[in-house]
């Protein structure tokens, strides 16, 4: 016997559906109606036939009471080919729900998203996460998607993007966005970062994550941030192959004084990079290739320094910097 496609835990909290059959019984998903966190994986299916069965232009207000009864706060949809019209229909209906977090992963969005009708209500998400989502509309996808969302989005994560750069002139500002995560876009690079950080469209960013994004030097990232007017409090550049030296011809970049936490772990560094901010609360240099303890003049003024997992550190070595947070044990790097 084939396993049930949907499983609801005994607390009505988590419901997971894996539709792997060529013609799945979508009604199985109804057992998820009382779950708080729902994951639906469509097994790579093309959802085009759905358009024939649903009226994408129907007034979603007719479903408002039904949708309001859903407990779902967090929804993950993955592994499908989705017509943009169907995605929009779903967003319009979900605007009446309690949904706060939406994750889309391994999706191919086909066709163009229609403009938001005047009477339509946007979806009041606090968090939107996209991983390996391709859009037929290329660079304008964020602007098209944005119009279907209310302006209160706080967290935006875009990984494995086919087009990580946006059509900046079409994108509206994200006034409430405090966390932007562009990690796992290895082809992004510092030029791509400049293109992705649309100037003055992310005025409230506090946390910027750029893990595994092809960044080359902290100074190059500094320049991209300065150009975009982005002033994060926390910056994660871990898991990039960073160069410690700066191109002598490159102009010196002044870091924003707002930056107080910098993660440079797993960056292949053999020495402390030049051009770091002068003062930081937290600096993570763990799991690099530092062969000697950094000298005080190489480091910023820092309250909390992590150097674990570097070759120069063996158990019992004196702490190389006042206020450092080394365990004395080399972690699995």
């Amino acid at each position: 016997t084939t396993p049930e496609p949907c499983e609801l835990d005994d607390e009505d909290f988590r419901c997971v559906c894996n539709f792997s059959e060529p013609q799945p019984d979508w009604s199985e998903a109804f057992q998820c109606v009382s779950a708080v966190e729902v994951e639906i994986h469509a097994g790579g299916l093309n959802l085009e036939p759905f358009l024939k069965r649903v009226d994408a232009d129907a007034d979603p207000r007719q479903y408002a009471d039904t949708v309001k009864a859903l407990r779902v706060r967090r929804l993950t949809v993955g592994a499908a080919q989705v017509p943009a019209q169907l995605l929009v229909g779903a967003l319009r209906v979900l605007a009446y729900s309690r949904l706060k977090e939406l994750t889309l992963e391994d999706l191919k969005i086909t066709g163009t998203m229609p403009p938001l009708p005047l009477e339509a209500t946007g979806l009041a998400l606090s968090s939107l996460r996209l991983r390996n989502v391709s859009w037929a509309t290329g660079r304008s996808w964020l602007a098209e998607l944005q119009q279907w969302l209310k302006p209160g989005l706080k967290v935006l994560s875009i990984a494995q993007a086919h087009s990580p750069a946006f059509s900046c002139e079409q994108v509206r500002a994200f006034p409430a966005l405090t966390s932007l995560d562009l990690s796992d876009n290895p082809g992004l690079g510092e030029r791509g970062l400049m293109a992705a950080l649309c100037p003055h469209k992310f005025p409230a960013i506090q946390n910027l994550a750029l893990r595994n994004t092809g960044m080359e030097t902290p100074t190059g990232v500094c320049a991209a941030l300065a150009a975009a007017g982005v002033q994060p409090h926390s910056l994660d550049l871990s898991h990039n192959s960073l160069r410690a030296t700066v191109n002598p011809s490159a102009p010196r970049c002044m870091w924003s004084s707002a930056l107080n936490s910098l993660n440079l772990s797993f960056a292949g560094l053999e020495q402390v990079p030049k051009g770091l901010p002068a003062k930081l609360r937290v600096l993570d240099l763990s799991c690099n290739r530092l062969n000697r303890a950094p000298q005080p003049d190489e480091l910023p003024e820092v309250d909390n320094l992590t150097l674990d997992g570097n070759p120069f550190l063996v158990p019992g070595t004196a702490l190389p910097h006042e206020g450092s947070m080394n365990s004395g044990v080399v972690p699995a790097c």
Epitope: E11, D12, S34, R73
Partner: antibody
Framework: QLQLQESGPGLVKPSETLSLTCTVS?????????WNWIRQPPGKGLEWIGY???????SYNPSLKSRVTISRDTSKNQFSLKLSSVTAADTAVYYC????????WGQGTLVTVSS | DIQLTQSPSSLSASVGDRVTITCRAS??????????LHWYQQKPGKAPKLLIY???NLQSGVPSRFSGSGSRTDFTLTISSLQPEDVATYYC?????????FGQGTKLEIK
């Protein structure tokens, strides 16, 4: 058998940050459910503070949201509460609890806010 | 926020009595076929203990003299035959919608 154990200082000064940790044994905080903090001022009723779910998603009581952070350390199977700018009104027994029907509770820890 | 109002706030009954506590919600706590209303017992100095979940389901290990009923906004906890060890404060709680809220409690004493 699932067990939850709260730990942290029993006395916090006004305006400081209250920090508590819940250590979970007999179950994984990253495999299922919601992991909550609930408090009870002396002689009063119960108040839900917020949760962190198996996925890392958080939900907070709006009455405390501006002061609360719930985080987790999956490697230690622990989740934590930070409540900033505390006053005497935050004096309470703090419980860590699993699920949204609260079937598993820690024994609770009394935190007194006083100078 | 959904407000839960319990009545009575306190009550005194004799051993063997049938005891009823009610909980009224300011709006429905139902999601489709389920009522997300739960009942707890708390003894002094102890953590609360789940008695009834989803309005009418008896939690494992709880004596069968405890039962729950109701839907949408009106719910009842019944103790069919009061025992001395049932002296405690009883709380209702909803998990249909965050913030998850509790009733103010009903203190039960033995006459």
């Amino acid at each position: 058998q699932l067990q939850l154990q709260e730990s942290g200082p029993g006395l916090v000064k006004p305006s400081e940050t209250l920090s508590l940790t819940c250590t979970v044994s007999g179950g994984s905080i990253s495999s299922d459910s919601a992991w909550n903090w609930i408090r009870q001022p002396p002689g009063k009723g119960l108040e839900w503070i917020g949760y962190i779910s198996y996925s890392g998603s958080t939900s907070y009581n709006p009455s405390l949201k501006s002061r609360v952070t719930i985080s987790r350390d999956t490697s230690k199977n622990q989740f934590s509460l930070k409540l900033s700018s505390v006053t005497a009104a935050d004096t309470a027994v703090y419980y860590c609890v699993r699920g949204l029907r609260f079937a598993y509770w820690g024994q609770g820890t009394l935190v007194t806010v006083s100078s | 926020d959904i407000q839960l109002t319990q009545s009575p706030s306190s009550l005194s009954a004799s051993v063997g009595d049938r005891v009823t506590i009610t909980c009224r919600a300011s709006e429905s706590v139902d999601s489709y076929v389920n009522s997300f209303l739960h009942w707890y017992q708390q003894k002094p100095g102890k953590a609360p203990k789940l008695l009834i979940y989803r309005a009418s389901n008896l939690q494992s290990g709880v004596p069968s003299r405890f039962s729950g009923s109701g839907s949408r906004t009106d719910f009842t906890l019944t103790i069919s035959s009061l025992q001395p060890e049932d002296v405690a404060t009883y709380y209702c709680q909803q998990s249909n919608e965050d913030p998850y809220t509790f009733g103010q409690g009903t203190k039960l004493e033995i006459k």
